[in-house]
């Protein structure tokens, strides 16, 4: 476990021409705040993918009002560090997104308004416990200067915060096979604890809580032998051996949850629901009471009345989980409609809407036809965030700019012949038929069939004949 720390040094216009306009004005004073999002690895991930390593939001900076006529200076910044705690190992390589947000403090209807001023992103290698790394990133005409570092929280040490240190039990040396903890020479490395139940013969770990299998073994605890029978399994050959993996058990098969925990499958893996008094990924941490301080992030521990309720954590706003170990990402409530992008700003949820949609939750389909003209007498029909034109006769295409063959749809009934005409089309009817589309038979006595109902309709039905 540890903390990633980010220190913003300055945010202001970058060098070169085209200095940006100040984001604040006398009419609209504003202040800045920052959001950092961390993801493990060096993958080029979309801005909206989850901040799997964590995220943090800064405090608000001082209120700033532009001096008329002055160029945008470096803007006043919030005090303090942005801190992103991580519970597991520090990955060493990570991706970051730092967003600069503006809070407008004018007379907004419904309170202050937020807007994204700049977003920078990057991919870096960083060892925990190292010195501050300095960086400069540009976003358009803006420049952001910042430093960052990752540090381990005791008792963890090392470049990945995976080695654990304990005070020496004897003053002279550490136990068998355990090294002193540099730079804390008066402490010793604690033995590595693999995932509970990890097979001692067929499994091993390089980080606490993991269980990696030796060749020929599989399963979450390395207790399942890899089948060496002929490859009939739909899974195909295993890369680890010449044999095949037996068809994969479901993530809850064999119930990986210890201590009476119940397993439920999730799209990506499984989740253990632990009885009170147990916690951990597989309910493997046991016998916990409030005296053990099981509630993270300032959660309030309340002792239960019976053994099944050894404790319960009442989480502060912003945290959830049996032990308040998870940061609440309120975007997981899926509040944004019509493909809007959700931003949990800590104090509020914001939806960034796709083109054609608006509203706090992107629920309003904008008038797609506003400002859109359909040529040649076409009429605009809106829907689904995109406009389309219903074209007048003789025209087609997205905006009715293309000439269409009006006779292509064979509009003349009863063998009538169609002629394209500048005003549309003309039907030359076969003998015995009449009407704009040759739709009406002519009576033998020469009278038109117009007053009578077409076949299949009773006289008096409210049909209009054209």
């Amino acid at each position: 476990a540890g903390v990633f720390e980010l220190q913003i040094h300055s945010f202001g216009p970058g060098p070169g021409p085209g200095a940006p306009r100040s984001p604040c004005s006398a009419r609209l004073p504003c202040r800045l705040f920052f959001r950092v999002c961390l993801k493990p690895g060096l993958s080029e991930e979309a801005a909206e993918s989850p901040c799997a390593l964590g995220a943090a939001l800064s405090a608000r900076g001082p209120v700033y009002t532009e001096q008329p006529g002055a160029p945008a200076p470096d803007l006043p910044l919030p005090d303090g560090l942005l801190q992103v705690p991580f519970r597991d190992a520090w990955p060493g390589t990570f991706s970051f997104i730092i967003e600069t947000w503006r809070e407008e403090l004018g007379d907004q209807i419904g309170g202050p308004a937020w807007s994204l001023l700049a977003r920078v992103a990057g991919r870096r290698r960083l060892a925990a416990g190292g010195p501050w790394a300095r960086d400069i990133q540009r976003a358009g005409a803006w420049e952001l200067r910042f430093s960052y570092r990752a540090r381990c929280e005791p008792p963890a040490v090392g470049t990945a915060c995976t080695r654990l240190c304990r005070p020496r039990s004897a003053p002279s040396r550490c136990g068998p096979g355990l090294r002193p903890c540099a730079p804390l020479e008066d402490e010793c490395e604690a033995p590595l604890v693999c995932r509970a139940g990890c097979s001692p013969e067929h499994g091993f770990c390089e980080q606490p809580g993991e269980c990696r299998c030796l060749e020929g073994w599989t399963g979450p605890l390395c207790t399942v032998p890899v089948s060496t029978s002929s490859c009939l399994s739909p899974r195909g050959p295993s890369s680890a051996t010449t044999g095949c993996l037996v068809p994969g058990p479901g993530p809850c098969d064999g119930n990986p949850c210890a201590n009476g925990g119940s397993c439920s499958e999730t799209p990506r893996s499984f989740e253990c629901t632990c009885p009170r008094g147990f916690y951990g990924l597989r309910c493997e941490v046991s016998g916990v009471t409030c005296a053990d301080g099981p509630c993270f992030n300032g959660g309030l521990c309340v002792g239960g009345a019976d053994p099944d309720s050894a404790y319960i954590c009442h989480c502060p706003p912003g945290f959830q989980g049996s032990n308040c170990e998870k940061r609440v990402d309120r975007c997981s409530l899926q509040p944004c409609r019509n493909g809007g992008l959700c931003l949990d700003l800590g104090h509020a949820l914001r939806c960034r809407c796709r083109a054609g949609f608006a509203g706090p939750r992107c629920e309003h389909d904008l008038d797609d036809c506003a400002g859109r003209a359909c040529a040649n007498g076409g009429t605009c029909v809106e829907g689904g965030g995109a406009h389309r034109c219903s074209c007048a006769l003789g025209f087609g295409g997205r905006d009715c700019r293309e000439r269409a063959d009006p006779c292509a749809a064979r509009p003349c009934a009863h063998g009538g012949r169609c002629y394209a005409h500048f005003s549309g089309l003309v039907c030359a009817c076969a003998p015995g038929y009449m009407g704009a589309r040759c739709e009406f038979p002519v009576h033998p006595d020469g009278a038109s069939a117009l007053p009578a109902a077409p076949p299949g309709l009773r006289p008096g039905d409210p049909q209009r004949y054209l």
């Epitope: 999730t266 706003p317 959830q320 609440v328 997981s332 899926q334 509020a348 706090p360």
Partner: antibody, heavy 117, light 107 residues
Framework: QIQLVQSGPELKKPGETVKISCKAS????????MHWVKQAPGKGLKWMGW????????GYADDFKGRFAFSLETSASTAYLQINNLKNEDTATYFC??????????WGQGTSVTVSS | DIQMTQTTSSLSASLGDRVTISCRAS??????LHWYQQKPDGTVKLLIY???RLHSGVPSRFSGSGSGTDYSLTISNLELEDIATYFC?????????FGGGTKLEIK
């Protein structure tokens, strides 16, 4: 039209497990989170938490941590509520409800769970 | 947690009456205040969301208002089908919380 159809009533003994289903239709299931609400006999409504239908990640209110589990079968547009180690105080009607970004706009008809020895 | 209080647990009114049901929050919050109707058969429906917006298909005799900590639901012309229990709910801060409910009966 939008519908949430829940499984039928359940009669269970203390210590047993129950799993209630909520089948959604009339909309894209993975676009809206699903929420669960408890109503004890003669009492008001109590929000239990939600599950993100895109990722499967649940969130539980404090009183529903431990024995309660939300899960999904996305291919069947179905959400589940599982209650383990049932107690008498779990006797209630449980509702699933869709969240539209403002409020819980459509609700299931409710599933009655009775726990009695 | 934000506590929601509906001081009137039951209310009698005559058909055609204008009925107002109130709800108070323990702390100031934004307008994510919603009203639900639970019929005697147990079915629950959303009536009003975001303080004053009418959910689709809900008759226009229902309206909502309020801000800060005090909110109300008004039925302008009571009909027989409005016999139900009405709950307010805040959706601003987790955990979401409901009022205790107001049961509406006909005199």
């Amino acid at each position: 039209q939008i519908q949430l159809v829940q499984s039928g009533p359940e009669l269970k003994k203390p210590g047993e497990t129950v799993k209630i289903s909520c089948k959604a239709s009339g909309y894209t299931f993975t676009d809206y989170s699903m929420h669960w609400v408890k109503q004890a006999p003669g009492k008001g409504l109590k929000w239990m938490g939600w599950i993100n239908t895109e990722t499967g990640e649940p969130g539980y209110a404090d009183d529903f941590k431990g024995r309660f589990a939300f899960s999904l079968e996305t291919s069947a547009s179905t959400a589940y509520l599982q209650i383990n180690n049932l107690k008498n105080e779990d006797t209630a009607t449980y509702f699933c409800a869709r969240y539209d970004g403002y409020a819980m706009d459509y609700w299931g008809q409710g599933t009655s769970v009775t726990v009695s020895s | 947690d934000i506590q929601m209080t509906q001081t009137t647990s039951s209310l009698s009114a005559s058909l055609g009456d204008r009925v107002t049901i109130s709800c108070r929050a323990s702390q100031d919050h934004s307008n994510y205040l919603h009203w639900y109707q639970q019929k005697p058969d147990g079915t629950v429906k959303l009536l009003i969301y975001y303080t004053s917006r009418l959910h689709s298909g809900v008759p226009s005799r229902f309206s909502g208002s309020g801000s800060g900590t005090d909110y109300s639901l008004t039925i302008s012309n009571l009909e027989l089908e409005d016999i139900a229990t009405y709950f307010c709910q805040q959706g601003d801060m987790l955990p979401w919380t409901f009022g205790g409910g107001t049961k509406l009966e006909i005199k």
